[in-house]
């Protein structure tokens, strides 16, 4: 066959779908690789062809669109499964071509089994809710396009294994689940099951997401430097190891980049000749507030090093702060020498 622009296997789009549920998969060519959409391609006389490679096989084969009840079908740039079966797992390819043009991309499709409590190997999206922030909602994801707006599906929400119908701060409102007040106890996996009719059959869509309750922007503050502080003096003799921790608390802020760094005499440690190492550790609270610790270490400190200015800096979307460490050289203890004047010469 003639040359075809092959975009390879698009592993960025690792598509996972539940067994025995409808799945609609758009050809990624139009979404991520080509500068035109399906309608433009179709009106230009291009044809979209689908084929697949079964799991653990090398042989590419056409997709059987003549299964009973049209279990697999294609509609425009969408491949439909009504419903999926476990052995539909494999790599799927969509190819756009005519006599002079060809472009194709493959993507993996994994059909996943779930248990009665919706546990599965499915990778779950995470939705962050602010703690005690007023009404917040999660929305049943990825259900657009499965049924027309004239169809009114039934939606049932679950937290873990339990149907949500008498939870004391959560109201199911169709495709939305409203949290009147989000608390740590609301952390967990939430599942919506959407049930709709189609051509005399009933289909179910199961969507699970993880809710993580995080610090509220109402409570967010600029970074707080706990160490160094005015109460601790780093007093060292030349030759000793100097260890100064910089410990900074950051309120949780959505999409904020938290930074901590040291300066020595106003310069970054990389820009000076001292043999200094910096080790960082990060810990998080239950609401994803962050504590970063950067330990500045000079193995054998010199008297010159003990005269330098060591400043810890911190920055978040809420602001920037800095704090100097109190470093000084230990004063040697005075030696008391007793001089005995004996044997004064007398003539």
């Amino acid at each position: 066959s003639e040359r075809c622009d092959d975009w390879g296997l698009d592993t960025m789009r690792q598509i996972q779908v539940f067994e025995d549920e409808p799945a609609r998969i758009k050809c990624p060519l139009f979404e991520h690789f080509l500068k035109f959409n399906y309608s433009t391609a179709h009106s230009a006389g291009l044809t979209l062809i689908w084929y697949w490679t079964r799991q653990d096989r090398d042989l590419e084969e056409p997709i059987n669109f003549r299964l009973p009840e049209n279990r697999i079908s294609k509609e425009k740039d969408v491949l439909w499964f009504r419903p999926t079966l476990l052995n539909d797992t494999g790599n799927y390819t969509c190819m756009l071509r005519n006599t002079t043009y060809c472009s194709k991309v493959a993507f993996p499709l994994e059909v996943v089994q779930k248990d009665s409590c919706f546990n599965s190997p499915m990778k779950l999206p995470v939705h962050k809710l602010y703690i005690e922030y007023g009404i917040q909602r999660i929305t049943c994801p990825n259900v657009d396009g499965y049924f027309p707006s004239s169809v009114k599906p039934t939606i049932t929400w679950y937290m873990g294994c339990y149907k949500i119908q008498n939870f004391n701060n959560v109201i199911p409102e169709g495709m939305n689940l409203s949290f009147l007040i989000a608390l740590i106890s609301n952390n967990g996996n939430y599942t919506c099951v959407v049930t709709y009719p189609e051509n005399g059959r009933t289909f179910h869509l199961t969507r699970t997401l993880t809710v993580k309750v995080v610090g509220s922007p109402k409570n967010a503050v600029p970074p707080v430097i706990h160490s160094p502080n005015d109460h601790v003096v780093y007093e060292k003799e030349p030759g000793e190891e100097l260890l100064i921790p910089c410990t900074v608390y950051f309120s949780f802020l959505m999409d904020s980049r938290n930074e901590v760094w040291w300066t020595i005499d106003g310069k970054k440690p990389d820009d000076i000749t001292i043999d200094v190492t910096i080790n960082e550790s990060i810990s998080h609270s239950r609401t994803e507030d962050e504590t970063r610790t950067q330990i500045l270490s000079i193995k054998k400190v010199t008297s010159e090093d003990l005269k330098r200015s060591y400043v810890c800096h911190a920055r978040s979307a809420k602001g920037e702060v800095a704090k100097a460490a109190k470093v000084k050289q230990k004063v040697p203890a005075p030696r008391y020498t007793v001089e005995l004047a004996c044997g004064f010469g007398a003539t």
Partner: antibody, heavy 120, light 113 residues
Framework: QEQLVESGGGLVQPEGSLTLTCTAS?????????MCWVRQAPGKGLEWIAC????????TYYASWAKGRFTLSKTSSTTVTLQVTSLTAADTATYFC????????????WGQGTLVTVSS | ALMMTQTPSPVSAAVGGTVTINCQAS??????LAWYQQKPGQPPKLLIY???TLASGVPSRFSGSGSGTEFTLTISGVQSDDAATYYC???????????????FGGGTEVVVK
């Protein structure tokens, strides 16, 4: 046995203020509940006023007509209070305190109510 | 804001008969509706929540149905003790103004003959 008792009702002058207290016995607010107030004018239907969540920082929701004149707060682990200002004759009603185990519609425990009469 | 409209009122029924009370919400409240029974001089009593879930200790002759904007309370095999006023209570949220709307219907008086 779990119980709610309202107090603080009585005769009040128009434009006056009052504080109604709801006291819980047999349980405390250390478990998180919605504590709510509902009123009923003589011979009329029920009217929701407000609810407070007894956990966390005490989020409160009010009926739109109640915003501004009514203030609901948790004053201890067993009491919530409803402060009402600028009273008019239309506020004459029996005020019920109710507990919601569920969300804010399933009031499964009610007090007997306290009558507030606004008259000169 | 949410408004709940109850019909009919009053309604009368013979002992052993069936009573149906309707409640209509001014907007979609999904299944977020409760039914209460109130007798003179008493506080209301919860019968049904989440539109169709029977509250603890409530006789099975009471049942609730509906979702969205139309709801029904049915009393099958009415007893004389069921003479009371019945209220629906709906709830919905408005995230744009961070508010919860709770609204009672006007009440339906049930007279048992």
């Amino acid at each position: 046995q779990e119980q709610l008792v309202e107090s603080g009702g009585g005769l009040v002058q128009p434009e006056g203020s009052l504080t109604l207290t709801c006291t819980a016995s047999g349980f405390s607010f250390s478990s998180n509940y919605w504590m709510c107030w509902v009123r009923q004018a003589p011979g009329k239907g029920l009217e929701w006023i407000a609810c407070i969540y007894t956990g966390g920082s005490g989020v409160t929701y009010y009926a739109s007509w109640a915003k501004g004149r009514f203030t609901l707060s948790k004053t201890s682990s067993t009491t919530v209070t409803l402060q009402v200002t600028s009273l008019t004759a239309a506020d004459t009603a029996t005020y019920f305190c109710a507990r919601d185990l569920v969300v804010v519609t399933s009031f499964n425990l009610w007090g007997q109510g306290t009558l507030v009469t606004v008259s000169s | 804001a949410l408004m709940m409209t109850q019909t009919p009122s009053p309604v009368s029924a013979a002992v052993g008969g069936t009573v149906t009370i309707n409640c209509q919400a001014s907007e979609d409240i999904y299944s977020n509706l409760a039914w209460y029974q109130q007798k003179p001089g008493q506080p209301p009593k919860l019968l049904i929540y989440s539109a169709s879930t029977l509250a603890s200790g409530v006789p099975s002759r009471f049942s609730g149905s509906g979702s969205g904007t139309e709801f029904t309370l049915t009393i099958s095999g009415v007893q004389s003790d069921d003479a009371a006023t019945y209220y629906c209570l709906g709830v919905c949220t408005d995230i744009s103004v961070d508010d919860v709307y709770n609204s009672f219907g006007g009440g339906t008086e049930v007279v048992v003959k």
